[in-house]
C-alpha cells in the first residue's frame, strides 16, 4: 500500500517590526512536537509594508489599519486556514516610537492604540503591540544569531550550516544597526561588567550567559545623518551647507523644521537666520569620517573603558554578526566579503564617496534617490562607529561577519522576541526522548 | 475557536437602562482592543464603542455621555453600560474583536413606551 503523507504538525508564529523607517512582518513556522529543541524555528516569509514607520502616522492614525493591511492579509494567505486562531502575532516597536514617546507619551499610545486595533480584527492570536527597550532589542538580537547558529545546542556538529560558524559553542556578538539607534551586545571574557545598565543574565539550554548590551539612541543611521546636519549647520557661514559625506554635484534642499523635528537633534538646536538650507555635496571621505566623529563624545568615560558618550564597553571578544542596515548599506557597497580588510573597505569609501553624483545616479539607476544619495554617509558612519565608536581596529576586522539572513532566517530581533514570548528557549537543556532524531521506527 | 457570546439585552423604556456582557473564549481576550457594534433595523453595522487592552476608550458621537464600555480581563468579559437610553438606540448589539473582527450572536436592545 501507498504510504499516505501524515498532515503536518507544525506552528506558526507571527512578530511585526516597527522600526523608524518601515515596518516588516516575519512568519515563522515550527514543528509543534520539537518546541523546545534549538534551532528548529524558521523564517517562511517577510513582508515589507509599504509606506513609512509607525511613527510617522502620528497625525493621520486613521490610516494605520489600511497601511497593515497587505502584509497581514498576505499572512492569511501563507498560514493555513486551521490554524489562524492559534497563531500568534506580536508588533514590538522599536525606537522610532521611543523618540515619540519621548516627545509624547499621549501620541505614542495613540499610535499603539490604533495598531492595537486594527491587528485585534485579524483572526490570529494578538498578543499586544508595544514599545521594547532598546536593551531588549539588543539581546533578543543577540538571541536571534546564536539560535540561528546553532550555539545553544550541546550536540556539537560534525559539518558547518554557515560560512562563518566554527564548530565550537562561543557565541557570536551582535551588532545592530537601525534607523533610530544601534545595538552592541556580546558575553565580554571574564570582565565584570562594570554599569549595571548594561548587564545580562541569561539561562538558556542549562548554560549562563553574562551578556553585555546597550543600545545608542539616535545613533541609527538616519537620526545620525540629522545629527550631523544640525551640527554642522550650527557654523555655515550661509544657506549652503558644502557637505563631504554627498557625493560632489548632489544637491537638496531642507527644512530647518525638518532638522530640529527629532529629539536627536536638540543638543545642536539653535535660531538660524534662514527656514531652508542647501546641501551641497563636495564628496570627501576623510572630511566626512572627521565630521561624524564629532558625534562621539571620547573625552569623558567615568569606567574602565567607554565606547563613547560616557557609555562603558567591555573589550571586543569574539566573533560578531553585524546585521539590518550594517548588511544592508555594507552589501550594497558589495563590502560583505569576509576577504576585504578594514583598509580596503577604507579605500573604496573613499573611491565611492569622491564620484559625482551623475556618474553614481547612471551606475544605480534602478535605485531611489533618497536612498542612493545617502550610501556615502552610511558607509562611512559605519566605518566611524565600528572602528572610533566601539573599538574595532584593523586587525579585529575580521571577526565582523556582514550578515543578512542565517539558514533562510533575517538576522534580527524580532525571531528571539517570539522565541522568548512563547517559551521556546528552555533555562535547562531538554531531555532527549527516546525516539532521537535518528531512530527509525 | 473564537467564541463571544453577548447577553444582558431585552426592552426598556426611554430614559431606562441596561448592562450588555460578552463573554469571550478561544483567544488571549486581554491583549485586544474590543469593541460594540449594533444593526438597526434595516441599517448597516455601526460602531459604537471600543476599549483597548489598557483600558482607554473611545465611542461614538452619539452615546457619548450615556454608554460606558469597560472590560474584566480576568473574567475573559466585555460590558456596555447604557443609560439615557433612546428609541434611536434600538438595535441588535454585537461584541467584536477588534472593531471588524469576529464578532458574537448579537443580543437584541428594544427602547420605546
Known amino acids: 500500500t501507498q504510504n499516505k503523507a501524515l498532515p503536518e504538525n507544525v506552528k506558526y508564529g507571527i512578530v511585526l517590526d516597527a522600526g523608524s523607517s518601515h515596518t516588516s512582518l516575519y512568519i515563522y513556522k515550527w514543528p509543534a512536537e520539537k518546541e523546545n529543541d534549538t534551532g528548529v524555528v524558521h523564517q517562511v516569509e517577510e513582508c515589507r509594508v509599504k509606506g513609512p514607520g509607525i511613527s510617522k502616522f502620528v497625525q493621520k492614525v486613521n490610516e494605520i489599519g489600511i497601511y497593515l493591511t497587505d502584509c497581514m492579509e498576505r499572512a492569511r494567505e501563507v498560514i493555513p486556514r486551521s490554524q489562524h486562531q492559534e497563531t500568534p502575532v506580536y508588533l514590538g516597536a522599536t525606537a522610532g516610537m521611543r523618540l515619540l514617546r519621548m516627545e509624547s507619551e499621549e501620541l505614542a499610545d495613540r499610535v499603539l492604540d490604533v495598531v492595537e486595533r486594527s491587528l485585534s480584527n485579524y483572526p490570529f492570536d494578538f498578543q499586544g503591540a508595544r514599545i521594547i527597550t532598546g536593551q531588549e532589542e539588543g539581546a533578543y538580537g543577540w538571541i536571534t544569531i546564536n539560535y540561528l547558529l546553532g550555539k545553544f545546542s550541546q550536540k556539537t556538529r560534525w559539518f558547518s550550516i554557515v560560512p562563518y560558524e566554527t564548530n565550537n559553542q562561543e557565541t557570536f556578538g551582535a551588532l545592530d544597526l537601525g534607523g533610530a539607534s544601534t545595538q552592541v551586545t556580546f558575553v565580554p571574557q571574564n570582565q565584570t561588567i562594570e554599569s549595571p545598565d548594561n548587564a545580562l543574565q541569561f539561562r538558556l539550554y542549562g548554560k549562563d550567559y553574562n551578556v553585555y548590551t546597550h543600545s545608542f539612541l539616535c545613533y541609527g543611521k538616519d537620526q545620525a545623518l540629522w545629527q550631523k546636519l544640525a551640527k554642522d549647520i550650527q557654523v555655515a557661514s550661509n544657506e549652503i551647507l558644502r557637505d563631504p559625506c554627498f557625493h560632489p554635484g548632489y544637491k537638496k534642499v531642507v527644512n530647518v523644521s525638518d532638522l530640529y523635528k527629532t529629539p536627536c537633534t536638540k543638543r545642536f538646536e539653535m535660531t538660524l537666520p534662514f527656514q531652508q538650507f542647501e546641501i551641497q555635496g563636495i564628496g570627501n571621505y576623510q572630511q566626512c569620517h572627521q565630521s561624524i566623529l564629532e558625534l562621539f563624545n571620547t573625552s569623558y568615560c567615568p569606567y574602565s573603558q567607554c565606547a563613547f558618550n560616557g557609555i562603558f564597553l567591555p573589550p571586543l571578544q569574539g566573533d560578531f554578526g553585524a546585521f539590518s542596515a550594517f548588511y544592508f548599506v555594507m552589501k550594497f557597497l558589495n563590502l560583505t566579503s569576509e576577504k576585504v580588510s578594514q583598509e580596503k573597505v577604507t579605500e573604496m569609501m573613499k573611491k565611492f564617496c569622491a564620484q559625482p553624483w551623475e556618474e553614481i545616479k547612471t551606475s544605480y539607476a534602478g535605485v531611489k534617490e533618497k536612498y542612493l544619495s545617502e550610501y556615502c554617509f552610511s558607509g562611512t558612519y559605519i566605518l566611524s562607529l565600528l572602528l572610533q565608536g566601539y573599538h574595532f581596529t584593523a586587525d579585529s576586522w575580521e571577526h565582523i561577519h556582514f550578515i543578512g539572513k542565517i539558514q533562510g532566517s533575517d538576522a534580527g530581533w524580532t525571531l528571539g522576541y517570539m522565541l522568548n514570548l512563547t517559551n521556546m528557549i528552555p533555562a535547562e537543556q531538554p531531555l532527549s526522548t527516546p525516539l532521537s532524531h535518528s531512530t527509525y521506527v | 475557536q473564537v467564541k463571544l457570546q453577548e447577553s444582558g439585552g431585552g426592552w426598556v423604556q426611554p430614559g431606562g437602562s441596561l448592562r450588555l456582557s460578552c463573554a469571550a473564549s478561544?483567544?488571549?481576550?486581554?491583549?485586544?482592543?474590543m469593541s460594540w457594534v449594533r444593526q438597526a433595523p434595516g441599517q448597516g453595522l455601526e460602531w459604537v464603542s471600543g476599549?483597548?487592552?489598557?483600558?482607554?476608550?473611545s465611542y461614538v458621537d452619539s452615546v457619548k455621555g450615556r454608554f460606558t464600555i469597560s472590560r474584566d480581563n480576568a473574567a475573559n468579559t466585555l460590558y456596555l453600560q447604557m443609560n439615557s437610553l433612546k428609541p434611536e438606540d434600538t438595535a441588535v448589539y454585537f461584541c467584536?474583536?477588534?472593531?471588524?473582527?469576529?464578532r458574537g450572536q448579537g443580543t437584541q436592545v428594544t427602547v420605546s413606551s
Open positions: 467584536t474583536k477588534g472593531d471588524s473582527g469576529a
Open positions: 476599549i483597548t487592552s489598557g483600558g482607554r476608550t
Open positions: 478561544g483567544f488571549t481576550f486581554r491583549t485586544h482592543f
